[in-house]
């Protein structure tokens, strides 16, 4: 019986060339979180392990920064960064919880004159 829920920043938008914070929060469970994975589609972006700390995938090292907290900061955004991002909480004894965030990266002028999603 998994009682936990993941709250995310939901659908967000950001300007091309800018940065964005991806954030998830696991609540309503006392389970022990052992690791949080951040993934984009099938690509692993980063891992935050309770004992070993952060590991950023080599191909994203220049554009991904750990934190704040268990979140992830994406920098130097390009239109190709548009898509789904997943935070995957590995817990004991519950198992795995997954949260989804959709990021849309907009051309600067579009973002200024009517972004579809608000950054919290």
């Amino acid at each position: 019986m998994m009682t936990g829920t993941i709250e995310t920043t939901g659908n967000i938008s950001a300007e091309k060339g800018g940065s964005i914070i991806l954030q998830c929060h696991l609540s309503s469970t006392t389970a022990q979180v052992t690791q949080v994975n951040w993934e984009q589609q099938d690509q692993l972006l980063a891992i935050c392990n309770a004992d070993l700390g952060w590991h950023i995938s080599p191909s994203f090292k220049d554009r991904v920064a750990p934190g704040p907290g268990l979140g992830l900061t994406l920098q130097s955004l390009t239109v190709n960064d548009t898509g789904e991002y997943f935070c995957i909480y590995h817990t004991y004894p519950d198992g795995t919880y997954t949260g989804r965030i959709f990021l849309e990266v907009l051309e600067s002028s579009v973002a200024e004159h009517g972004a579809r999603f608000q950054i919290p």
């Epitope: 019986m1 009682t3 006392t30 022990q32 979180v33 052992t34 935050c48 309770a50 004992d51 907290g69 268990l70 004991y92 004894p93 519950d94």
Partner: antibody
Amino acid sequence: EVQLVESGGGLVQPGGSLRLSCAASGVTFSNYWMNWVRQAPGKGLEWVAEIRLKFNDYATHYVESVKGRFTISRDDSKNSVYLQMNSLKTEDTAVYYCTMVRRNWYFDVWGRGTLVTVSS
Amino acid sequence: EIVLTQSPATLSLSPGERATLSCSASSSVSSGYLYWYQQKPGLAPRLWIYSTSDLASGIPDRFSGSGSGTDYTLTISRLEPEDFAVYYCHQWSSYPYTFGQGTKLEIK
């Protein structure tokens, strides 16, 4: 061998304060949740407070009867956890045990306890 | 708050007999969050069974645990003299964590 040693117990008047300490050895302290559990003379066990890891932003939780009066904290550099007890009541009289927990490793170790007596 | 009620409060048995200790929760507890501890006079409690049915390190296999939802059981198939003690069930499924009031297993 893992060892937990509590200290700081003693006789205190109602309304007074005490600070309990628990020192750990033989283990990487920062990897473990820490708890305080108490046992009134001749009675059963009562969980008092918990502090999690830096990974969890040192999240703390308390039993309702001590909220606002007791504060749990930890110093990973000193391998120690503390319980600051203010506005003590006669019903706080108990042996206070420090416990070290790592759920996914099935690790659960207790100290020998320190006696707190609240009496006028 | 999840209230854990243990029964019986005292169980008087002889070595060699079978012991069954019960723990009833006021609301459902996931099996991974239900533990049992043993405590002997003057000593700290010791983890005995975790996740409902898994024996802690060094615990003899005459002990077993079972249950789900709101009803859990600790069973000792054949009592040895060193088994006589107080046993507490414990849940860490929700805050505040709680313990049962204990079952004292005494020699008849």
